[in-house]
Structure formats: structure tokens, C-alpha cells
């Protein structure tokens, strides 16, 4: 499994010169092992390509989404997978390639005429003023810069945190995702026992703000495991 990789962000088995520079013999930094796909074939590496372990779509490339590589696979083992092209099956928008969105389980074109009617009722000021990314790739959230002019405010529907205004993140709320405030010092946060477990949350909290981390509240150390309260605390 990828558990060891999911629990460690170390990058290893790098080609020289990055793998271990002179003076740092122990600096070789371990990539994900081969992933088993349906049919049992090991993940084939191309140019030493190693799948990237992830917990959220936003951690992946612009043309990828985060999911378990096997149908019905362990929810804790997720990697970035290639996005689905038009007319392919999908379960959420992020699974579809840029320029498409998920409608009735199928990736369809998100050109202005299709998309505006579909989600206009539920989105208010949801997306940023320019949806071309800095690196020149169109994002999966691209709708049209003419359609939406401000970053999503609190409560706006979103696909990823970059769709939300500063101080907000994109988090699950029932079966959609909305912009919610990034957590402040002292606020209750969710500490996931294993990566990927937040996929089960219906009401997802944002992450802790800059300089804060989600830790057990000091006076809750004695409490039972299940009732331990985590709050955002200074590093």
C-alpha cells in the first residue's frame, strides 16, 4: 500500500544530482511503490514517473484528480489520476478535464451556454476574476472570466480553495463544497487519523490558518481517544 508514502512527504529515489549531493551522502530522498490497478498490472513508470499520493484534488496537477486507483479501493490510499475526458463517467466536477464538468455522472463541456444554466442558481460570485492559471494551463474550474468577477465569498459554491476569497477555503458542506473561513487560533479543528479519511465528512472544516496547527487541546489529554478535542494552536 501507499500508507508509508501518505504518512511521509519525503521524496526519495531521485536521479542525480538532486538525489544526494556531495557532502550529504544520506540525502537520497522514497517514491511511491508501484500501484496495483485492476487486472493486477503494476503501475508502469514512464521516465521514472511515480504516482503522487494525495488527500485532495487540489494537491494534484491541473489535469488530475485525487482518488483511489482501484475501484472500491482503500479510501486511505489515494493518488493523483489523469482527469476524465468528455463523455467519460464521473462522480464530481474535479474528475473531468479542464473545460468540462460532471453532469449526471458524465463529463460534459462547460462552455458558457451549458454551464451557466446548470449552476447559476446555486453559485453567487463563486469564482475568481481570471481563470487562466499563472502557468498558462486552464484550470478545471474555468467557466469564463466574463461570468464571475470576484473570488467566492463565505457560503459561495466552489470546487477548490483558490476559488475562494482570502481567508476562506473550499470545504465540503452536505454534498457540495462551499467557501468557509480558515480556522483561527483556539477554534476546533479536525485531525484526521489517516490521510483520506476526510472524504467521509459531510461538514468539512477548513484547515488552521498561517502559523497554526491542529493539536489536542491541552486539558483534553486525559480524555478518551474518541472525545479528544483538537484546536488550532500556535506552532
Amino acid at each position: 500500500t501507499l500508507n508509508s508514502v501518505l504518512n511521509s512527504n519525503a521524496i526519495k529515489n531521485l536521479p542525480p544530482p538532486l538525489g544526494g549531493a556531495a557532502g550529504h551522502p544520506g540525502s537520497a530522498v522514497s517514491a511511491a511503490p508501484g500501484i496495483l490497478y485492476p487486472g493486477g498490472n503494476k503501475y508502469q513508470t514512464i521516465d521514472n514517473y511515480q504516482p503522487y499520493p494525495c488527500a485532495e484534488d487540489e494537491e494534484c496537477g491541473t489535469d488530475e484528480y485525487c482518488a483511489s486507483p482501484t475501484r472500491g479501493g482503500d479510501a486511505g490510499v489515494q493518488i493523483c489520476l489523469a482527469c476524465r475526458k468528455r463523455r467519460k463517467r464521473c462522480m464530481r466536477h474535479a474528475m473531468c478535464c479542464p473545460g468540462n464538468y460532471c453532469k449526471n455522472g458524465i463529463c460534459v463541456s462547460s462552455d458558457q451556454n451549458h454551464f451557466r444554466g446548470e449552476i447559476e442558481e446555486t453559485i453567487t460570485e463563486s469564482f475568481g476574476n481570471d481563470h487562466s492559471t499563472l502557468d498558462g494551463y486552464s484550470r478545471r474550474t474555468t467557466l469564463s472570466s466574463k461570468m464571475y468577477h470576484t473570488k467566492g465569498q463565505e457560503g459561495s459554491v466552489c470546487l477548490r480553495s483558490s476559488d475562494c476569497a482570502s481567508g476562506l477555503c473550499c470545504a465540503r458542506h452536505f454534498w457540495s463544497k462551499i467557501c468557509k473561513p480558515v480556522l483561527k487560533e483556539g477554534q476546533v479543528c479536525t485531525k484526521h487519523r489517516r490521510k483520506g479519511s476526510h472524504g467521509l465528512e459531510i461538514f468539512q472544516r477548513c484547515y488552521c490558518g498561517e502559523g497554526l496547527s491542529c493539536r489536542i487541546q491541552k486539558d483534553h489529554h486525559q480524555a478518551s481517544n474518541s472525545s479528544r478535542l483538537h484546536t488550532c494552536q500556535r506552532h
Partner: nanobody, 129 residues
Amino acid sequence: KVQLVESGGGLVQAGDSLTLSCTASGRTFDNYAMGWFPQAPGKEREFVAAISWSLSRTHYADYVKGRFAISRDNAKNTVLLQMSSLKPEDTAVYYCAAAPRPKRISVSYFSTTSNYDYWGQGTQVTVSS
């Protein structure tokens, strides 16, 4: 004009701590990964730490894990590298760099120098024994 400016370098004793700062201007870098790459005299520039566009993900070379910590503040367009328990072999010019979010990502993306489009001028860190 896009610029990355490093600061915070200096001369310290082995075992000391130092925090390097990198400030970006001319563009917002929230859709970029930011990394630190030291280069010792006569050696290749190497990867030590990176933080992705998704704030939760940090990546480190094994030899600095537990000693170095990278963080970013997108509102201020700043990336910090907190270095502790410094060793003489950490002596190098430390470069800050920015890599765009790619179409496809692999495990080695953050550690590969050629993926980084923008580079600072570097800040010298010298650790004496």
C-alpha cells in the same frame, strides 16, 4: 517584472538556528510551488524543501527532515525556511524558486530544479564549527 528576493542568511555556529525568507513580487504565487535549493561551492544546486500550492503539502530531502521547516504566507507572498541544528555541511548559497502547478504531477516534481521557472539571487548561509 517577477522577482524573488531572499534574505536572512548569515554566519552562524554549528547547532544554531536561522530563518530564511523569500519575498515574491510582480505576480501572485498562490498557484506555484515554492522551494529552497542550496548550492555549495563547486557543487550542483540541490533540493532541500518545497511547499506546494496546496498549503498542507511540504516536501523535504531526507537529510534535513526534522531540522528544516518550510512555510508560506500567500497574503504576503512570502516563503520561510526555518533551519535548526545547523551543520557545517549546510553551508551554501540558498536559492528560493517557484514552480508552476503542472498538468500532471509525480513524486519527484518538487525536487526537480528544471520544474522551477523563477529563481532568486540567493542568500549565503555559512555554518562554522
